[in-house]
Amino acid sequence: MRRGPRSLRGRDAPAPTPCVPAECFDLLVRHCVACGLLRTPRPKPAGASSPAPRTALQPQE
């Protein structure tokens, strides 16, 4: 018989914990992992056809 729905905290997942500065908490694997920085480009000038897509800085390797 299949299990019922899992809670959104996953399979016995601990609550998110503080990570060191170069890391962030991955809810999927429930651990701190290496993280890059999100970067939102400055808005285009008035009259631009569409908002600039959001991008990111790559994690440090």
């Epitope: 905290r9 996953g10 908490f25 809810l27 694997v29 651990h31 992992v33 920085l37 999100l38």
Partner: antibody, heavy 125, light 107 residues
């Protein structure tokens, strides 16, 4: 340059075993999570397993739990998928992939950014 | 497990068309959705992560939106190289699950 290279696929009889390897270069696997995803011929993508090599945590799809084991050797920067008790329905191209994370208010915002070329596993008598 | 339901399963479009693919999660996944493009015989490529963030190197004609249970991938002006199969994936909770795919074909 980040690269993932799978190996170890092939033809195996039902009930047999195979060990797939995923050799990583250009990054350290201990700092991220590595996933195996498979694709049966003409079908969609199915996640199989993940490992966080830096912590040793693993998880599996229900369809492979108890038969497959994911592991990693951080000294070789390589992840593995040991597949036992193989069934015809395990026939697929197996990909390994790295999950990339970006910091969004302290939580990972990410996806699988680098994938291997895939290795075909055929289970047939 | 969280089910990801994509629609349509296939569509025919012409170069220059605006194409929209939707993905519905069976429960709230916040913004933890990624979109991938796959061409025959090739590995998938990440296009969008966290529902609306464009991955590095992906053309700006691709965009994503949504949160909670409903998500959209839009190609603003379809190019010849965009004919492929597209998958959504949630990564809010293990197991990470994919949609069944949407094949974008030439009309």
């Amino acid at each position: 340059e980040v690269q993932l290279v799978e190996s170890g696929g092939g033809l195996v009889q039902p009930g047999g075993s195979l060990r797939l390897s995923c050799a990583a270069s250009g990054f350290t696997i201990s700092s991220s999570s590595i996933h195996w995803v498979r694709q049966a011929p003409g079908k969609g993508l199915e996640w199989v397993a993940w490992i966080t090599p830096g912590h040793g945590s693993t998880d599996y799809a229900d369809s492979v739990k108890g038969r497959f084991t994911i592991s990693a050797d951080t000294s070789k920067n390589t992840a593995y998928l040991q597949m036992n008790s193989l069934r015809a329905e395990d026939t697929a191209v197996y990909y390994c992939a790295r999950r990339v994370c970006y910091n969004r208010l302290g939580v990972c915002a990410g996806g699988m950014d680098y994938w291997g070329q895939g290795t075909l596993v055929t289970v047939s008598s | 497990d969280i089910q990801m339901t994509q629609s349509p399963s296939s569509l025919s479009a012409s170069v220059g068309d605006r194409v929209t693919i939707t993905c519905r999660a069976s429960q709230d996944v916040s913004t933890a959705v990624a979109w991938y493009q796959q061409k025959p015989g090739k590995a998938p490529k990440l296009l969008i992560y966290s529902a609306s963030f464009l991955y590095s190197g992906v053309p700006s004609r691709f965009s994503g939106s949504g949160s909670g249970t409903d998500f959209t991938l839009t190609i603003s002006s379809l190019q010849p190289e965009d004919f492929a199969t597209y998958y959504c994936q949630q990564s809010r909770i293990t197991p990470p699950t994919f949609g069944q795919g949407t094949k974008v074909e030439i009309k």
